[in-house]
């Protein structure tokens, strides 16, 4: 028969290949079926007959078109600071990834080997640049006009309120105090926000503030991206 | 022969920082993690954070992230340990352990070599 | 945070006798890579620690096959099949399966 009609298993042409999800057998010197993902070869082809396919063990898998004669095993539990994204199943392998509030440190070959809680920014510091799953929170001191009050992982500095009176000055960790009953706030560049952290992490970025057209308004330079070592804690 | 080497004992007051250094000799520096340790007069060891010499990274124990900075020099093979606004419970011995977990899978994944220990007393 | 507890807190040995140390973690010390980091470390006295055991049973370089790790999920056993007076000092379990890194508190090994 033709090689494209041929049924498996069949010797190919000389200096032939196998056909798509097929392989050559060293020993039978046959073109023979593949196992789908799922399965695995039970029994190797002959000359006469096909290889045999068997279904995965629980806790196995194979991912490709395969003729292994065992299922991969899958990989242990996750360790408790890390989640299952996906499950073991017949045809994949089990991901696990570091749980929400933690991103990966150090990384290898079989996985995340250390998973790091995420920064949190102190009260005066917000966050620079959001964590990933695979970086840390950055974060920086909060620029004149601006403030944040909150230990936080995601939290920004924010603009301080703009006072028709001022009860008690803004700082870095403190929003104004005011006597009118109508604060408003200003929009200062050194607050622009970022963008949300990534889903892995539960968030609470501040609504962006509108531009306000307030007596007093100052505009203020924005802040550079490189913080300093301190601003952070554990708590 | 593979070692690390540590500064001299330090007498600080309490508020005042302290920087400890820890030089490494006979092994790739860059292809290794350094932990620093402490241990107070008759207690045991407490891991106060670690450093990626590879890529500079850092991460600290909770209790200690406000205060503590580790860093590198890769050039002379040195890291270093820098505690602030220090206090009289930060009394101790500061080791830096290598920590064999950047390499292969095979590797021993622990504190495999210890410096001497440097020791630091806050007194007023 | 994983915590480490280790018993007896002191052990008199005979020279030449067994000594065993045990130690328990709060959790599971299994990484999602297959692998268990429980180290046991030494520290004579004045001196530095110094590795002994690495992944539950691994001896490190350098190490007397007197000593012997074993275990395996929360529970580990470092022995010494016949103390030498060299070995008095304090043992210490450590898990670097995930931060923070802890230690137990330590056991004294002394000479009866």
């Known amino acids: 028969l033709p090689a494209q009609v041929a049924f498996t298993p069949y010797a190919p042409e000389p200096g032939g290949t196998c056909r798509l999800r097929e392989y050559y057998d060293q020993t039978a010197q046959m073109c023979c079926s593949k196992c789908p993902p799922g399965q695995h070869a039970k029994v190797f082809c002959t000359k006469t007959s096909d290889t045999v396919c068997d279904s995965c063990e629980d806790s196995t898998y194979t991912q490709l078109w395969n003729w292994v004669p065992e299922c991969l095993s899958c990989g242990s539990r996750c360790s408790s600071d890390q989640v299952e994204t996906q499950a073991c199943t017949r045809e994949q392998n089990r991901i696990c990834t570091c749980r929400p509030g933690w991103y990966c440190a150090l990384s290898k070959q079989e996985g995340c080997r250390l998973c790091a809680q995420l920064r949190k920014c102190r009260p005066g510091f917000g966050v620079a640049r959001p964590g990933t799953e695979t970086s840390d929170v950055v974060c920086k001191p909060c620029a004149p006009g601006t403030f944040s009050n909150t230990t936080s992982s995601t939290d920004i500095c924010r603009p301080h309120q703009i006072c028709h009176v001022v009860a008690i000055p803004g700082n870095a960790s403190m929003d104004a105090v005011c006597t009118s009953t109508s604060p408003t706030r200003s929009m200062a560049p050194g607050a622009v926000h970022l963008p949300q952290p990534v889903s892995t992490r539960s968030q609470h970025t501040q609504p962006t503030p509108a531009p306000s057209t307030a007596p007093g308004t100052s505009f203020l330079l924005p802040v550079g991206p490189s913080p300093p070592a301190e601003g952070s804690t554990g708590d | 022969q593979v070692q690390l080497v540590q500064s001299g004992a330090e007498v600080k007051k309490p508020g005042a920082s302290v920087k400890v250094s820890c030089k490494a000799s006979g092994y790739t520096f860059l292809s290794y993690g350094l932990s620093w340790v402490r241990q107070a007069p008759g207690q045991g060891l407490e891991w106060m954070g670690w450093?990626?010499?590879?890529?500079?990274?850092?991460n600290y124990a909770q209790n200690l992230q406000d205060r503590v900075t580790m860093t590198t020099d890769t050039s002379t093979s040195t890291a270093y340990m820098e505690l602030r606004s220090l206090r009289s419970d930060d009394m101790a011995v500061y080791y830096c352990?290598?920590?064999?977990?950047?390499?292969?899978?095979?590797?021993?994944?622990?504190?495999?070599?210890w410096g001497q220990g440097t020791m630091v007393t806050v007194s007023s | 945070d994983i915590v480490m507890t280790q018993t007896p807190l002191s052990s008199p040995v005979t020279l030449g006798q067994p000594a065993s140390i045990s130690c328990r973690s709060s959790?599971?010390?299994?990484?999602?890579?297959?692998?268990?980091?429980l180290n046991w470390l030494q520290q004579r006295p004045g001196q530095p620690p110094r590795l002994l055991i690495y992944?539950?049973?691994n001896r490190f370089s350098g190490v007397p096959d007197r000593f012997s790790g074993s275990g395996a999920g929360t529970d580990f056993t470092l022995k010494i099949s016949r103390v030498e007076a060299e070995d008095v000092g304090v043992y210490y379990c450590t898990q670097t399966t995930q931060f923070p890194i802890t230690f137990g508190q330590g056991t004294r090994l002394e000479i009866k």
């Open positions: 352990a290598r920590w064999d977990i950047l390499t292969a899978y095979y590797s021993s994944d622990a504190f495999d070599i």
């Open positions: 959790q599971s010390l299994v990484h999602s890579d297959g692998n268990t980091y």
């Open positions: 450093i990626n010499a590879y890529n500079g990274n850092t």
């Open positions: 992944k539950v049973s």
